[in-house]
């Protein structure tokens, strides 16, 4: 069974206890007495129920990562210390660790350290020291999350305030706007036009279309409204029809343009 | 002091059945996958079953499958092997032995992967 001609080479496997916070680096020390000629050193955990995992292993001057690439082996200048680690611990990562030094044939024998115990503790955010530290990064796919639903509701309530603008904005700029002296006096038709008439311009207001603002509709001509426009003081002549933007340049009327009727 | 020793071999009819075990000590005995071999008078020494460690998976020899089953109880450091409907070919000594991995990755070859052996014990089947 065992070699009497090969030492029993005692190994050594620290700290005793390791506690880190979850995301950071845990590192152990696995140590040889001596260096062997031909060896394989494995790194283990020990699971609840007296099962195990070998996380990695060292053979040959190479190193064998286990299945998961966060378990690392590294085998330091002096030959005979390796430091195991785990990048980014998880809580789950907490237990019992050793190392097993394995000498190859032709004298077989198997070497295991004493066990350490990780304990990996959940993140705790600390108060503001003089020189307050960044608050921990959240892991990548969760990192991703919040950016994609931040940046989703930006998205919707700039969406909603520009239909709010346009809404509110919108119907007036495409329907235009004029002043009404009195809506009570008729249109006035006579044959003495006077040659020269002045327009009084301002806002045209509808009782009857309070309400709220609905969104722009494109411009069709059959949808234009029209509004009596009365010329206070002179007498009444045929008026002329005109678009929005004829509002623009005030000209006077001329008496081929037909009823005195103003699109809105 | 790592010691490994078989226990449960005897006589048997062909069509019989045995349940062989493996008592480990001197190790943590669930670090290590473990193999069952045997040797017949004359023959080589085969590999007839291994069990990880991990998850307790399982191979068989094809000469053994659908028979034997391997089984372990790492908190009595012990394996075992249940043998049914044995025949005379299966006569002969059985061994249990560690491996250093901890997965029966390697088959059941013989190699230079296997650290431990017991003393072995003998299965005999005749009518």
């Known amino acids: 069974l065992d070699s009497p001609d090969r030492p029993w080479s005692p190994l050594t496997f620290s700290p005793a206890q390791l506690t880190v916070q979850e995301g950071e680096n845990a590192t152990f020390t696995c140590s040889l007495a001596d260096i062997p000629d031909s060896f394989v050193l494995n790194w283990y955990r020990l699971s609840p129920r007296n099962q195990t995992d070998k996380l990695a292993a060292f053979q040959e001057d190479r190193i064998e990562p286990g299945r998961d690439r966060r378990f690392r082996v590294t085998r330091l200048p002096n030959g005979r210390d390796f430091h195991m680690s785990i990048v980014a611990a998880r809580l789950n990562d907490s237990g019992i660790y050793l190392c097993g030094a394995i000498y190859l044939p032709p004298n077989t024998q198997i070497n295991e350290s004493p066990r350490a115990e990780l304990s990996v503790t959940e993140r705790t955010l600390e108060p503001p020291t003089q020189s307050p530290s960044p608050p921990p990064r959240l892991s990548g796919q969760l990192q991703g999350l919040v950016i994609g639903v931040t940046s989703v509701l930006v998205g919707v309530l700039l969406l909603l305030l520009l239909t709010w603008v346009l809404a509110a904005v919108f119907p007036r700029a495409t329907r235009g706007a004029c002043v009404c002296g009195s809506e009570d006096e008729p249109l006035k038709e006579g044959p003495d036009a006077a040659p020269v008439f002045t327009l009084d311009y301002g806002e045209l207001d509808f009782q009857w279309r309070e309400k709220t603002p609905e969104p722009p509709a494109p411009c069709a001509p059959e949808q234009t409204e029209y509004a009596t426009i009365v010329f206070p003081g002179r007498p009444a002549s045929p008026g002329r029809r005109a678009s929005a933007s004829s509002l623009q340049g005030a000209q006077p009327p001329s008496p081929e343009d037909g009823p005195g009727l103003w699109p809105l | 002091q790592v010691t490994l020793r078989e226990s449960g071999g005897g006589l048997v009819q062909p069509g019989g059945s045995l349940r062989l075990s493996c008592a480990a000590s001197?190790?943590?005995?669930?670090?290590?996958?473990m193999t069952w071999f045997r040797q017949a008078p004359g023959k080589d020494r085969e590999g007839i079953s291994c069990i990880s460690s991990s998850d307790g998976s399982t191979i068989y020899a094809d000469s053994v499958k659908g028979r034997f089953t391997a089984s372990r109880d790492n908190a009595k450091d012990t394996m075992y092997l249940q043998m049914n409907n044995l025949n005379p070919e299966d006569t002969a000594v059985y061994y249990c032995?560690?491996?250093?991995?901890?997965?029966?990755?390697?088959?059941?070859?013989?190699?230079?992967?296997?650290?431990?052996w017991g003393p072995g014990t003998q299965v005999t089947v005749k009518p």
């Open positions: 001197g190790l943590t005995f669930g670090l290590y996958a």
């Open positions: 032995a560690t491996d250093y991995e901890t997965r029966c990755d390697y088959g059941l070859r013989l190699r230079d992967r296997t650290a431990y």
